[in-house]
């Protein structure tokens, strides 16, 4: 808190300009009118105010707007946004994408702060869903944004927004998140032809079920090993050797290097060694010839 002191003669601010950087904290408090500050917020970011000076300016705005700042002020906060607490931001009603962009710009190049997370949450909740323009904006500033959402939050993403997602936006998504995103992507890209469809759907395949992988194996897609290794283990296990061979195409040779890692390891254990041998890769660990495979999960379901 800055003590209330009278403004020295001749120092009353008539406008927000660079001369204010030479004001002490108490002079800013005494000589800058809060209403003037609010109407000239767009000038604040053009002036190199220090951490302490920004504290005083924030204090003045807080007194003027105890219920929360209007959007006309929020849009021009600039570096003053860094002084806001999540509690301050929860009082705001941010509806304009331009306001969101302006505030995200302030923190650009730095990791997502609690303020930014709260701002995004308020904005998305206010819109009711994560529309394409918002998603475009958020992933441009924070490529990992999508993967920071819970499966429940992701369920509000409309399929049309999936067009805004780039492969790198999904890098940190876990299988539960991809389970939610994959059906949306499938719907979004359903009218594309085979090769174009595969290019778009590839990043989402960590959420694909077995039947979709079987269908892809019939389309000469030549899936790379990096994508294959991100597939759900339970979706890969029922695939036959022939299906995996068709799915990977020339990349099938990469299985040898991954034979000790999931899902390749678990898939090998489910295949007949005879079938694995047809690949000519020296994959070992399949079911020996003459052994009968009992599907115990099926047996339990029947009993």
């Amino acid at each position: 808190e800055v003590e209330k002191t009278a403004c020295p003669s001749g120092k009353k601010a008539r406008e927000i300009d660079e001369s204010l950087i030479f004001y002490k904290k108490w002079e800013l408090e005494a000589c800058v009118d809060a209403a003037l500050l609010a109407t000239q917020m767009d000038r604040v970011n053009a002036i190199p105010f220090t951490y302490e000076q920004l504290d005083v300016l924030k204090h003045k705005l807080d007194e003027l707007y105890p219920q929360g700042y209007p959007e006309s002020v929020i849009q021009h906060l600039g570096y003053l946004f860094l002084k806001m607490s999540p509690e301050d931001i929860r009082k705001w009603n941010v509806t304009s994408l331009e306001t969101l962009k302006a505030l995200l710009e302030v923190n650009k190049g730095h990791e997502m702060s609690p303020q930014v997370a709260t701002l995004i949450d308020r904005f998305v909740k206010g819109r009711g869903q994560l529309d394409k323009d918002t998603l475009d904006t958020l992933t441009a500033f924070y490529p990992g944004y999508l993967c920071s959402l819970s499966p429940e939050e992701l369920s509000s993403v409309p399929p049309s927004s999936i067009w805004a997602v780039r492969p790198q936006d999904l890098d940190t998504c876990d299988p539960r998140q991809l389970d939610v995103l994959y059906p949306k992507a499938r719907l979004a890209f359903q009218n594309m032809n085979g090769s174009e469809y595969f290019v778009k759907i590839q990043s989402f395949l960590g959420g694909a079920p077995t039947e979709d992988l079987k269908a892809l194996s019939q389309q000469n897609v030549s899936m790379d090993l990096a994508t294959f290794m991100k597939l759900r283990t339970d979706a890969v296990l029922p695939l036959t050797v022939a299906e995996v061979q068709k799915l990977l195409g020339p990349h099938v040779e990469g299985l040898k290097a991954e034979e000790r890692h999931r899902p390749v390891r678990d898939w090998i254990l489910r295949q007949r060694q005879d079938d694995l041998d047809t690949l000519g890769l020296g994959l070992q660990g399949g079911i020996p010839n003459g052994y009968l495979v009992l599907d115990l999960s099926m047996q339990e379901a029947l009993s």
Epitope: P48, F49, Y51, Y79, L82, G109
Partner: nanobody, 114 residues
């Protein structure tokens, strides 16, 4: 954000120095910047500033002697100091934008006029 100030040293009264401040990223090309100084036992005070629009302002004590400038291509800010006085002895810092708002500072560069 990293801020690296350089160019300080020991100089006789009436002499000149040119301080440089380099920043990581494109911080100085887009933000308002300023030079500050802190004399022993004193608080840090602003000496010269440049708005994001390019206009400059100086503390009364250095007006006519110091000049702030920037090279956006090199992402560097300069402080040309002429007619130096013993009262200019201090550690000089530059800052602006995100790091200034977050109170992150460089090591500074020491200027001694004696």
């Amino acid at each position: 954000v990293q801020l690296v100030e350089s160019g300080g040293g020991l100089v006789q009264p009436g002499g000149s120095l040119r301080l440089s401040c380099a920043a990581s990223g494109s911080m100085f090309s887009i933000n308002a910047v300023a030079w500050y100084r802190q004399a022993p036992g004193e608080q840090r005070e602003p000496v010269a500033a440049m708005t994001s629009g390019g206009s400059t302002i100086y503390a009364d004590s250095v007006k006519g002697r110091f000049t702030i400038s920037r090279d956006n291509a090199k992402n560097t800010v300069y402080l040309q100091m002429n007619s130096l006085k013993p009262g200019d002895t201090a550690v000089y810092y530059c800052n602006g934008g995100w790091s200034l708002a977050m109170d992150y500072w460089g090591q500074g560069t020491s200027v001694t006029v004696s």
